[in-house]
């Protein structure tokens, strides 16, 4: 066959889906690597091909489209199951092509197994909350395009194993559910199932999500350098080790970029050439407030570096703070023998 | 299409056990859940309790803790349900259904299996 | 325990006639409400879920509603494969339970 373009294997797209649940999944190459969708391919003549290879094989073999009740069929660039069933995990391919043009791509679909609790090797999207913050919500996720809209579902939302009803300040509204007022105790493992009739047969869809509460933006602050500070003296004689830590605090921002750094003599430390290393640790709160400390760390330090200015800088979407360390040279104690003796008139 | 086949009628002493199946087929035996149900002749329906063949898990009423026993068998695709201590009163049919969460609980019965305690 | 009551126990009704049958929690639960029908000497047969959807193959004639603890299937017009026994079940929390039960015969 003539030279086709394929695009390899999308590990980016790595779909999961549940066992014996309808799966819709459309076609890579439309929505990641070709620069025109499936109507104007279509309308110009091309075909899309689907095949797949099963796990743990390499042969290459066409889709079955004539499946009993179809449970797999094509629609436009959509591969259908309805439903899954576990031996469709593998790497399905869609290929674009007509005489001229040929382009691929494959992706791996893996069909996963859920325990009574919901628990599965499923990668669950997160959804952030504020805590405190007044009414937020979450959507039931990934269920558009699986009944038209004249179809109305029912849908039951539960956290961990249990049905949420009669919870405080947790309220199921269809596809919605409402937090009244966020707190740290709705941290969990949120799942809606929906179930919806299609041509005479019932169909449940389920979806989990994590839920994780965090900082609200009402209460975030700038970042604050906990250290260094006035309180503190870095003294040291030449060729003592060095050792000054910056400790700054940030408020969870969503999508803030926090960031930390050393300056010496106003110079970032790769542009200097003393032989300094810097060392940094990361710690959270349990609403993703942040804790990042750097430790500027100079193994053998001289008169010179004693002399420099060290200073702590850190930035976020709030703002941009630095504090400069109190470093000094540490006057040698007077030796007994001789400073003492000499303050004493001694001959 | 979605089936469960019960196993047939038992016959029993008081103080004995007896253990009936419920096999499915047509679907993914261990995606839903199972759930039993007692009806004593010209009585009404009575929940006895529910497993998960996925990975095994039961609720039951509290009436039939330590009664029931609800286990499943995932390579045959068969519940099974197990009655100990018997007595008159436990001379019922016993239906299994087929239920998934949250919405849609009960959809596909058994025919039942009746299970008379005579001595 | 959730108790469900289920009236009329037992009723005549005509074919053609529209028949109402209700069920009443002893709590609100939340439309976590079943309805089947039995036919003697048969399994039961699920008709509707969640209060108000109606079952894959379940005729347009039969409809449930409610909300809260008050519950209701109403049949359109009667017609005789929908004479047997009516339960209603609450699947809002466990244990599940059921109605006693309405007999529905030909008057």
């Known amino acids: 066959s003539e030279r086709c373009d394929d695009w390899g294997l999308d590990t980016m797209r790595q779909i999961q889906v549940f066992e014996d649940e309808p799966a819709r999944i459309k076609c890579p190459l439309f929505e990641h690597f070709l620069k025109f969708n499936y109507s104007t391919a279509h309308s110009a003549g091309l075909t899309l091909i689907w095949y797949w290879t099963r796990q743990d094989r390499d042969l290459e073999e066409p889709i079955n489209f004539r499946l009993p009740e179809n449970r797999i069929s094509k629609e436009k660039d959509v591969l259908w199951f309805r439903p899954t069933l576990l031996n469709d995990t593998g790497n399905y391919t869609c290929m674009l092509r007509n005489t001229t043009y040929c382009s691929k791509v494959a992706f791996p679909l893996e069909v996963v197994q859920k325990d009574s609790c919901f628990n599965s090797p499923m990668k669950l999207p997160v959804h952030k909350l504020y805590i405190e913050y007044g009414i937020q919500r979450i959507t039931c996720p990934n269920v558009d395009g699986y009944f038209p809209s004249s179809v109305k579902p029912t849908i039951t939302w539960y956290m961990g194993c249990y049905k949420i009803q009669n919870f405080n300040n947790v309220i199921p509204e269809g596809m919605n559910l409402s937090f009244l007022i966020a707190l740290i105790s709705n941290n969990g493992n949120y799942t809606c199932v929906v179930t919806y009739p299609e041509n005479g047969r019932t169909f449940h869809l389920t979806r989990t999500l994590t839920v994780k509460v965090v900082g609200s933006p009402k209460n975030a602050v700038p970042p604050v350098i906990h250290s260094p500070n006035d309180h503190v003296v870095y003294e040291k004689e030449p060729g003592e080790e060095l050792l000054i830590p910056c400790t700054v605090y940030f408020s969870f921002l969503m999508d803030s970029r926090n960031e930390v750094w050393w300056t010496i003599d106003g110079k970032k430390p790769d542009d200097i050439t003393i032989d300094v290393t810097i060392n940094e640790s990361i710690s959270h709160s349990r609403t993703e407030d942040e804790t990042r400390t750097q430790i500027l760390s100079i193994k053998k330090v001289t008169s010179e570096d004693l002399k420099r200015s060290y200073v702590c800088h850190a930035r976020s979407a709030k703002g941009e703070v630095a504090k400069a360390a109190k470093v000094k040279q540490k006057v040698p104690a007077p030796r007994y023998t001789v400073e003492l003796a000499c303050g004493f008139g001694a001959t | 299409q979605v089936q469960l086949q019960q196993s047939g009628a038992e016959l029993a002493r008081p103080g004995a056990s007896v253990k009936f199946s419920c096999k499915a087929s047509?679907?993914?035996?261990?995606?839903?859940?199972m759930q039993w149900v007692k009806q004593r002749p010209g009585q009404g329906l009575e929940w006895i309790g529910t497993?998960?063949?996925?990975?095994?898990?039961?609720r039951y009423t509290q009436k039939f803790k330590g009664k029931a026993t609800l286990t499943a068998d995932k390579s045959s695709s068969t519940a099974y349900m197990q009655l100990s201590g018997l007595a008159s009163e436990d001379s019922a049919v016993y239906y299994c259904?087929?239920?998934?969460?949250?919405?849609?609980?009960?959809?596909?019965w058994g025919a039942g299996t009746t299970v008379t305690v005579s001595s | 325990d959730i108790k469900m009551t289920q009236s009329p126990s037992s009723m005549y009704a005509s074919l053609g006639e529209r028949v109402t049958i209700t069920c009443k929690a002893s709590?609100?639960?939340?439309?976590?409400l079943s309805w089947f029908l039995q036919k003697p000497g048969k399994s039961p047969k699920t008709l509707i879920y969640?209060?108000?959807r109606l079952v894959d193959g379940v005729p347009s004639r039969f409809s449930g509603g409610g909300s809260g603890q008050d519950y209701s299937l109403t049949i359109s017009s009667l017609e005789y494969e929908d004479l047997g026994i009516y339960y209603c079940?609450?699947?809002?929390?466990?244990?599940?339970?059921f109605g006693s039960g309405t007999k529905l015969e030909i008057k």
């Open positions: 259904a087929r239920g998934y969460f949250g919405n849609l609980v009960f959809d596909v």
């Open positions: 497993i998960y063949p996925g990975d095994g898990n039961t």
């Open positions: 047509g679907y993914t035996f261990t995606s839903y859940w």
């Open positions: 969640r209060a108000d």
């Open positions: 079940l609450q699947y809002d929390e466990f244990p599940y339970t």
């Open positions: 709590q609100d639960i939340n439309t976590y």
